[in-house]
Structures are given as structure tokens and as C-alpha cells.
């Protein structure tokens, strides 16, 4: 048997990060392993691909990787297939979005003393926790004049006044990470003495030892003050610079210049504006050092002459976003022509054999350059080494038909039988070299076979006729165990075929002759009226000249067929009470009883505490609930036959008795008598 040494497990995963679903198999022979996602085969991509028997994810995607994964192992020789446990990802992600005005409908409608509601459009799983900022300062719930609704992601200012003016942003964090608003909202409720933002500093990315400039301007009457701070709250002025910011200059217009930037200069810079009245405005901007990661490897590609193909180059992660270009033989590809670059894609139009070779994708930004090669092969049409030949194959033995071809890349061979594609199963096997093996030749295998050898460049085909040398056999083989109904007429057929039409006769297995009421007519054993003595072992003998004789042994059982003594009745039960569905059957051999409830067999070993099937076949359901309503089928079966009977079960609410009704009032339904289970 195929055994899973390692099975995939359900697990947490982070959007865009690596993950691995493990699968490891032990089997007596070679097996091929593939993966299913929600029952459909998983195709390899550069992002998600088989790694040995396991499934590797270079970057988990919450849309493409949601669902149930299963590892399937198949032994192509025996046809045995085994499936692993199901596994799924709990994918954690967060996605930025803008701050938008929810109320009033437009900015023009914002007046002092009106209610203003802002909404943070950041989403994620698990649901993130939101934090609001005004001019970079966190707003906590319960502060005067505003309400933060974390569930609704809303910030409500009531009533809005000049002190609420400023740049509103939001951030959200979860187990996955954090994101801040991609677009912020400036609320302007005029008060001349309050500082207002004229120019806000922007995040900057620079290469090591380059310079960086942050601009910052506020306006107010009288003019506001402006101060710069770095990370640890150290003020930056032209007179007193902190030791790690010796090369910082603050200009009269509020701009901050940093020269010869080093890693220790990276971080958050705060620009603070203070008017005569109102709160200080704190604006933040981050200085990032440029960086670039390595690029993922390309799989080799196979293309056909004359076609158009594209190869996508995923740029490596980097700050700033790296630019991408393609080169071939050391020359950068143009943006038009037959072989050219379009966006991040390499495009090969009307491919020629001469286009084969190594193409290089380059990515670069301020931090440096990365490159990755892709090997492109141009496919050729297959040619013959050995065509299939007309063949005589013996029934019941393996048969082989050759189909040997060569090409670049290695050709794929498929076989057709009577113009129908042969899918590999327990009888047919296509070897790596294209040879077809018929594991056990059958009479109807005598027909035309055609093999087709293909590469992406084209295909060739040839056909051959198979003649089957038929063996002497029963058609069909008589069932080794058969039942006859006591006191009724019965027939037991036996027929056979061979290279010559065989003679067929019946005899009792002990050699004794058949009784006079039993006749053997051209292979059909006929019992005029079955008696108990007719039970026993019989032998059917088929023979012809060239192939000798064959025998089939049949054990005949005499039985009394099943009838129901007690059948289940249509039953109505109050919710919480006990339902009893009775069923009793008789026959010989004594029948066994099974129940089917709501289209599934009730397994006595898995019924749970509420259901029980008694020895006599009756089904009891305690503490019935509305979902127990439905059709219940009693199935009685023995080694000779099977019968079933069904009845509906209705579960209803117990009616509340009206004032006028006494305790003895009859219920509105025909109820069965049950015991009530009390819940504590």
C-alpha cells in the first residue's frame, strides 16, 4: 500500500511570505505525486510549485491559495491512488487604503460646529486595530469632542472646530503587520492664529552617502514657529546639531538638508509647527536607505518556431522600486521589433530556431543591480526511430506496441484505440520511450491502434492493427455463489467462448447425476421447482478440440426471500422528546437491518449519544431536534437479497396550551408516546 510518511498540516501563513505543505510517501513501487486545490490539480508556477513531493510557496497569495489542499500519490503500475489529509492556510494580510470623508457628503459642506466623520480604508485578516492621527499625533478614544469607533474604522468629530484642523491619517495593525493610510485627509476649519500646513515633508529614499532634503512649511497669523526633531526627540538646529546629524542644515523656509547620509541617519524626522493659539502640528517623514533583494530563479522555457511567447520578470523587492530591463548576448533589448521588451516582459514574436539561448533580466535601483538568466529552447518536430507494427496478441497475456521517436525537447507520446484516446489505467501503460503495454489483452482489444508523438513544434503519427488470439473462457464466468428462492422456478446460465465454439455441460460437484426435475439445456441449468435438496456445489464444464476444457464451480443456496414483519410508520414527535421507528424483517438466512437517515447510512459505531439501533432493528432518537426531521429508510438484507421500506419523521414545537385548555387537552397532531429529556 501507499503510505504517507509526512502529511500536509493546516497552518498560519503570511501574505507574500514563503510557506511549505509537506508530503512524503512510501510505496512498494514508483509513484507520482501531485496536488489538488479544492479538488482541482495544482499547476506549477514560479510562485507555487512542487518541490519533491511537497508543495512550495515562494509568496503566499490570499486569493489564489485560499481553499483546501490535498496531496495525492498514484502508483501508475497498479492504479492504486491514496489521498492525504486536507490542509489549508489561515492567511494573514493587511492592505493600505485612503482616509475618506464619510460625513458630510462633501468638503464644501464642512462648517464649524458640524459633525465630521472620517473613515479609514485599511483592511486585513485578522481584522486590524485602528489608530487615528492628527498631524502625526495619535488620537485616543475619550478625548474631548471626538469618538473613535474601532469596529467601524470611523473617527467622528462633534462638533468640529478650528482646533480640529489638520492632516488626518490612520494606521492599522494586526498579527500580520501594520499599514498606514495611502492618502490622508486635510481638514481645514479656519482660525488664523492656528498653525496650518502649507507644505508637508515627504518620505525620502536615498543611496548611502547621497543627500536628502525634507521640505516643511506652516502658516498662521502671527507667523508660527517651526522646529525639526529626529527619532529620539533630539532637536535639530544650525547651532546645536546632535552628534549623528553633524551634516544637517535647517533653511529659513523650513527645509532640512542632510548630506552624506549614513544608515544611522535613517529614521523618522518630525517637523513641528506652533501657532499663537491651538495645538502644535507635528508632521512626520521617514528617511529610508535604498536597498535591493535577490531575484527569483527562472525555470527553463520551451517555445515553438513561428509562435509568440512572453517571459515575465518579477522585479526584486527594493527601495525605491527597481527598474527592469532585458538583455540578450550582452545587448539590451529594444522596446519594439520582433524580440523586444514590453513593461517587465520579454516578448518573442514569430520565434525562430536562432532565438534559442540565454536571456538576462536586469533590475536596478539606487542600491545596486541584480540579474537572472532564463534559458530558452526552441522545439523541433519529432522523427521516427520505430513505428508500431501490425501484431497478433494472445488474450490474457501482456501485449506491446512500439512508438519510438526523437525530438527537442523529449516528445510526448499518446495512444488512440479506435480513434479514442487511451488514458493510462490498470490495463494500459505507456512507457517513457512511448511503447504501449496492454497488461492483460482482451478480445475487444483486437482493433486499430494509433500513436501520436508531439512536441510544442508539431507531431507525427502511425497506426497498426492488433489481432487477438482468443482463449477458452466463460462469458461471463458464473457467479461462484448464487441464491435460489425456495419453492420457485430457477435457472443458472453458463456460456463460454474460444477459438472454436465450445460444448457446455453441468454436473454436480460430487459427480452424482442431476435429478430428473433439473435439466441442462445448452448450458442453462433449469430447476422446475426449487427444493432444499437442490442446494449444493455444481460444476459447469466447457470444452473444445484445440483448447481442452475449463471448469467453473458454483455453490447454490436455497433461501426464503426477505419480508417485513414490522414497518416504520409516519411519526410526529415534539422537539426534545424521543422518537421510535420500528422495523423487523424475516427471511432465511436471517436478515440484518441497517438504517438510512436523510440520504446517509447511519453507522452504528458513529451514531453519537442521541441515536441507537436495537438488536431487533428498531431505531430510537433521543432529544429530537428540527434537523432530525426527514425520511428514514429501514434496509433489510442477507446474503441472498435486500429490501427496504421508509417513513417520514416530523419534529414539531410543543404548543403552548391556552387558558381554556385543561391539562388533558389532546395535542393538534397524532403524537407517539415518548419520554422527555430535561437539560440542566
Amino acid at each position: 500500500a501507499i503510505v504517507f510518511i509526512k502529511q500536509p498540516s493546516s497552518q498560519d501563513a503570511l501574505q507574500g511570505r514563503r510557506a511549505l505543505l509537506r508530503c512524503e510517501v512510501e510505496a512498494p513501487g514508483p509513484v507520482h505525486v501531485y496536488w489538488l486545490l479544492d479538488g482541482a490539480p495544482v499547476q506549477d508556477t514560479e510562485r507555487r510549485f512542487a518541490q519533491g513531493s511537497s508543495l512550495s510557496f515562494a509568496a503566499v497569495d490570499r486569493l489564489q491559495d485560499s481553499g483546501t489542499f490535498q496531496c495525492v500519490a498514484r502508483d501508475d503500475v497498479t492504479g492504486e491512488e491514496a489521498r492525504s489529509a486536507n490542509a489549508s492556510f489561515n492567511i494573514k494580510w493587511i492592505e493600505a487604503g485612503p482616509v475618506v470623508l464619510k460625513h458630510p457628503a462633501s468638503e464644501a459642506e464642512i462648517q464649524p460646529q458640524t459633525q465630521v466623520t472620517l473613515r479609514c480604508h485599511i483592511d486585513g485578516h485578522p481584522r486590524p486595530t485602528y489608530q487615528w492621527f492628527r498631524d502625526g499625533t495619535p488620537l485616543s478614544d475619550g478625548q474631548s469632542n471626538h469618538t473613535v469607533s474601532s469596529k467601524e474604522r470611523n473617527l467622528t468629530l462633534r462638533p468640529a472646530g478650528p482646533e480640529h484642523s489638520g492632516l488626518y491619517s490612520c494606521c492599522a495593525h494586526s498579527a500580520f503587520g501594520q499599514a498606514c493610510s495611502s492618502q490622508n485627509f486635510t481638514l481645514s476649519i479656519a482660525d488664523e492664529s492656528f498653525a496650518r500646513v502649507v507644505l508637508a515633508p515627504q518620505d525620502v529614499v536615498v543611496a548611502r552617502y547621497e543627500e536628502a532634503m525634507f521640505h516643511c512649511q506652516f502658516s498662521a497669523q502671527p507667523p508660527p514657529s517651526l522646529q525639526w526633531l529626529f527619532e529620539d526627540e533630539t532637536p535639530i538646529t544650525n547651532r546645536s546639531r546632535p552628534p549623528h546629524l553633524r551634516r544637517a542644515t535647517v533653511f529659513a523656509n523650513g527645509s532640512l538638508l542632510l548630506t552624506q547620509v549614513r544608515p544611522r541617519n535613517a529614521g523618522i524626522y518630525r517637523c513641528i509647527g506652533q501657532g499663537q493659539r491651538g495645538p502644535p502640528i507635528i508632521l512626520e517623514a521617514t528617511l529610508h536607505l535604498a536597498e535591493i533583494e535577490d531575484m527569483p530563479l527562472f525555470e527553463p522555457r520551451v517555445f515553438t518556431a513561428g509562435s509568440e511567447e512572453r517571459v515575465t520578470c518579477l522585479p526584486p523587492k527594493g527601495l525605491p522600486e527597481p527598474s527592469v530591463w532585458w538583455e540578450h548576448a550582452g545587448v539590451r533589448l529594444p522596446t519594439h521589433g520582433r524580440v523586444y521588451q514590453k513593461g517587465h516582459e520579454l516578448v518573442l514574436a514569430n520565434i525562430a530556431e536562432s532565438d534559442a539561448g540565454v536571456y538576462t533580466c536586469h533590475a536596478a535601483n539606487l542600491a545596486g543591480q541584480r540579474r537572472q538568466d532564463v534559458n530558452i529552447t526552441v522545439a523541433t518536430v519529432p522523427s521516427w526511430l520505430k513505428k508500431p507494427q501490425d501484431s497478433q496478441l494472445e488474450e490474457g497475456k501482456p501485449g506491446y506496441l512500439d512508438c519510438l521517436t526523437q525530438a527537442t525537447p523529449k516528445p510526448t507520446v499518446v495512444w488512440y484505440r479506435n480513434q479514442m484516446l487511451i488514458s493510462e489505467d490498470s490495463r494500459f501503460e505507456v512507457f517513457k520511450n512511448g511503447t504501449l503495454r496492454i497488461n492483460s489483452v482482451e478480445v475487444y482489444d483486437g482493433t486499430w491502434y494509433r500513436c501520436m508523438s508531439s512536441t510544442p513544434a508539431g507531431s507525427i503519427e502511425a497506426q497498426a492493427r492488433v489481432q487477438v488470439l482468443e482463449k477458452l473462457k466463460f462469458t461471463p464466468p458464473p457467479q461462484p455463489q448464487q441464491c435460489m428462492e425456495f419453492d420457485k422456478e430457477a435457472t443458472v446460465p453458463c456460456s463460454a467462448t474460444g477459438r472454436e465454439k465450445p460444448t457446455i455441460k453441468w454436473e454436480r460437484a460430487d459427480g452424482s447425476s442431476l435429478p430428473e426435475w433439473v435439466t441442462d439445456n445448452a448450458g442453462t441449468l433449469h430447476f422446475a421447482r426449487v427444493t432444499r435438496d437442490d442446494a449444493g456445489n455444481y460444476t459447469c464444464i466447457a470444452s473444445n478440440g484445440p483448447q481442452g476444457q475449463i471448469r467453473a464451480h458454483v455453490q447454490l443456496t436455497v433461501a426464503v426471500f426477505i419480508t417485513f414483519k414490522v414497518e416504520p410508520e409516519r411519526t410526529t414527535v415534539y422537539q426534545g422528546h424521543t422518537a421510535l421507528l420500528q422495523c423487523e424483517a424475516q427471511g432465511d438466512p436471517k436478515p440484518l437491518i441497517q438504517w438510512k437517515g436523510k440520504d446517509r447510512i447511519l453507522d452504528p459505531t458513529k451514531l453519537g449519544p442521541r441515536m441507537h439501533i436495537f438488536q431487533n432493528g428498531s431505531l430510537v432518537i433521543h432529544d429530537v431536534a428540527p434537523e432530525d426531521s426527514g425520511r428514514y429508510t429501514c434496509i433489510a438484507g442477507n446474503s441472498c437479497n435486500i429490501k427496504h421500506t421508509e417513513a417520514p419523521l416530523y419534529v414539531v414545537d410543543k404548543p403552548v396550551p391556552e387558558e381554556s385548555e385543561g391539562p388533558g387537552s389532546p395535542p393538534p397532531y397524532k403524537m407517539i408516546q415518548t419520554h422527555h429529556h430535561h437539560h440542566h
Epitope: 500500500a1 503510505v3 504517507f4 510518511i5 498540516s9 497552518q11 512498494p28
Partner: antibody, heavy 120, light 107 residues
Framework: QVQLQESGPGLVKPSETLSLTCTVS????????VYWVRQPPGKGPEWLGV???????NYNPSLKSRLTISKDNSKNQVSLKLSSVTAADTAVYYC??????????????WGQGTLVTVSS | EIVMTQSPDFQSVTPKEKVTITCRAS??????LHWYQQKPDQSPKLLIK???QSISGVPSRFSGSGSGSDFTLTINSLEAEDAATYYC?????????FGQGTKLEIK
Amino acid sequence: QVQLQESGPGLVKPSETLSLTCTVSGFSLTSYGVYWVRQPPGKGPEWLGVIWTSGNTNYNPSLKSRLTISKDNSKNQVSLKLSSVTAADTAVYYCVKHDGGNYVGVMNYWGQGTLVTVSS
Amino acid sequence: EIVMTQSPDFQSVTPKEKVTITCRASQSISDYLHWYQQKPDQSPKLLIKYASQSISGVPSRFSGSGSGSDFTLTINSLEAEDAATYYCQNGHSFPPTFGQGTKLEIK
């Protein structure tokens, strides 16, 4: 019916090799794999390794360097060899039939076990 | 490897009482968990397979439940013959690992 019987010396000296044989009946080693499991006195069972119908083996990573499992299908015998033993290898050793399914499997047929003591 | 943790380590119970033993796996193992009973000087005996499937010949008072990483063995009305040590086993991936065991004593 299915039976498994472990045999081998009850006493082994430290640094020597512990050798045990499991003789099976009621099933064929060409149809079912066999596990070895041990249980130190007063502790829970510990899975040692398995030999499959193909003759392939899997071992517990903690013992891989010291453990060898082999079999002789014709004699219906599976053998275990554990080298460089110490007192920590003192345990009751069981052989167990794999259930023939597609998974790690339930262990429903166990030998009666044989106690091996490591002592000088 | 998958680590299996049982609780409690020891329990002293009177006959007819309901007993619950829990088992936790270090990662999700779906329903690939089996329970065994072991009495002194005997081989372990299979009680429940695949988390909740009962075994022929095992009294119906033994039942199992759970899926993922948390599982429970329940003995509905304890009998004197149930004094033993109970183990859970990971049947999901190799190596098969056992819990440290729960010893059940009858008062």
C-alpha cells in the same frame, strides 16, 4: 490469527549491540509493514522505526545513527539491531503490525514484548 | 516531529464517575489521532482510532472527540477494570509520537 513474537537476549552490556527478532504469523511481510516500539520502565511508548513491504525503512531521527531494521520474508522474521547501547536503552521492546492503510496507521496488533536490560 | 501533550498526568476516580482525558498536538493533525489503554505487564490495546471511531470489542463507555490539535477521550461510567494508563498517538505524520500518558486509579 495475527501473531507477533519478539525474541532475543534479556541482558546486554553497555556499548554492545542489542539484537532482537520478531517472528510473525497470520499475515505476510510482503503485504504489511512492521514497526518496532519500545517502552522504558514507567514511561510512555517510543516509536523506533518501520520496515515496509518493499524493504525500505524509516527510523526515528533520534536513533537513526544507531538503528538498523531488516527482514527475511521467507522466514517471516523482522530483526532490529541497536548499536552502542547505554542504560537509557533499557526498555520493553515490541514489534507491531502496520494496519496496511495509507497513513501512519493504528497499532492494533502488538507482540507481547520482551524486556531488555542494559547493564554490566 | 509532532509533540503530543496529555493532561492530567494522574487521576484518581470513583467507579461510575465520568472521566475526561485531553490530548494536544503541537500542530494541526486533522483527525489522525488514536487512543490506547495499557494495563501493567500488558501490551498497549487500541481503544479509539481516528479521533472518534470506536473499535470492535471495546466497551461503548469509551468515546473520543476532537479535530485539529485538541482531542478528548471520555469514559462515561468508570468501571474497576478501567484502571490503567491511557496514551494518545499522532497518526498524521512520521515519526508516530505518543503522549506521556495519563494514569487512572480507582478509589
